[in-house]
């Protein structure tokens, strides 16, 4: 169970002190992925690190991906795991550390010179070969948006929302991800009743735009749970 996974790591990350002046908040820490994890202001080995439960890659850090901690383990028990370094095996882009992506089941460097064409080809092939994701689609990837020279326009292939131009987000379309418009007031949105349920969407909608939230449309309150319509409404 998830509890047993979590309880096997007793030391909890401590919050950083808030007493310091705003101009002296401390220094950045970095760690070699897969070796050390930062905890508060000190390093902790993975043995002492409290794994974070997750439903999708986006809930993990940029140097992590979301998966079951045991091979062939309970699919319902997922935690954030350290990303895979270059030349390590992978099943989707998110498993590879920043600056790398998953090609033919191996994490390879995202060389800027041939990155764009190759990654689009890889996105396509990732969904139709033996190295496709466990559930049939790719989620967040840690590829840096700096590798794209220009922000993607509507319909452009993307890996994460920061690859898309302002007013667009990166959302699934069939088994790829493309830049789609962020939802405006009154537009139908998807409210996920349970964590990770958006994994089932083939045509994923963007989130609601700034100042809006996805709520039940007022005249649909009486409808049955399954047919309730959600729209983007002002806070």
């Amino acid at each position: 169970t998830l509890n047993s996974v979590l309880n096997s790591n007793a030391i909890k990350n401590l919050p950083p002190p808030l007493g310091g002046a705003a101009g002296h908040p401390g220094s950045a820490v970095s760690a070699a992925p897969g070796i050390l994890y930062p905890g508060g202001n000190k390093y902790q080995t993975i043995d002492n690190y409290q794994p974070y439960p997750c439903a999708e890659d986006e809930e993990c850090g940029t140097d992590e991906y979301c998966a079951s901690p045991t091979r062939g383990g309970d699919a319902g028990v997922q935690i954030c795991l350290a990303c895979r370094k270059r030349r390590k095996r992978c099943m989707r882009h998110a498993m590879c550390c920043p600056g790398n992506y998953c090609k033919n089941g191996i994490c390879v460097s995202s060389d800027q010179n041939h990155f764009r064409g190759e990654i689009e080809e890889t996105i396509t092939e990732s969904f139709g070969n033996d190295h496709s994701t466990l559930d049939g689609y790719s989620r967040r990837t840690t590829l840096s948006s700096k590798m794209y020279h220009t922000k993607g326009q509507e319909g452009s292939v993307c890996l994460r929302s920061s690859d898309c131009a302002s007013g667009l987000c990166c959302a699934r379309h069939f088994w790829s991800k493309i830049c789609k418009p962020v939802l405006k007031e009154g537009q139908v949105c998807t409210k996920h009743r349970r964590k990770g349920s958006h994994g089932l969407e083939i045509f994923q909608r963007c989130y609601c735009g700034e100042g809006l939230s996805c709520r039940i449309q007022k005249d649909h309150h009486q409808a049955s749970n399954s047919s309730r319509l959600h729209t983007c409404q002002r806070h």
Epitope: P16, G26, G40, Y52, E59, T62, R140, S145
Partner: nanobody, 125 residues
């Protein structure tokens, strides 16, 4: 290196609303956690709300749950704090802060490395 600039706060009546923004310069924003802190006169700075690098996870202190909403737009390098149903006890200097989001943990437990200069929010009764 990330530099954060908060929008102007202001004076608002109890029950009113205010929207703060926090704009970052530097390419690290889209892979950083963002938090909003506040410090009332004579009190310690407290963590109000946070959002992870992707926007998939948010956290709210009990005192602001249901009234405040945090969001972010990585394409604009900006985070937002929408404050509704404001109370006099929300009066404080509000700080936007950011830190690397390399490894997931509770949003209140990150090391917030970069800080804005703070903006005054006053709620009158």
């Amino acid at each position: 290196e990330v530099q954060l600039v908060e929008s102007e706060g202001g004076l608002v009546q109890a029950g009113g609303s205010l929207n703060l923004s926090c704009t970052a310069s530097g390419s690290a924003f889209s892979s950083s956690v963002v938090g909003w802190f506040r410090q009332a006169p004579g009190k310690e700075r407290e963590f109000v709300t946070g959002i992870n690098w992707s926007g998939a996870r948010t956290y709210y202190a009990d005192s602001v749950k249901g009234r405040f909403t945090i969001s972010r737009d990585n394409a604009k390098n900006t985070a937002y704090l929408q404050m509704n149903s404001l109370k006099p006890e929300d009066t404080a200097v509000y700080y936007c802060a950011s830190g690397r989001d390399r490894y997931a943990r509770e949003l209140s437990e990150y090391e917030y490395v970069w800080w804005g200069q703070g903006t005054q929010v006053t709620v009158s009764s």
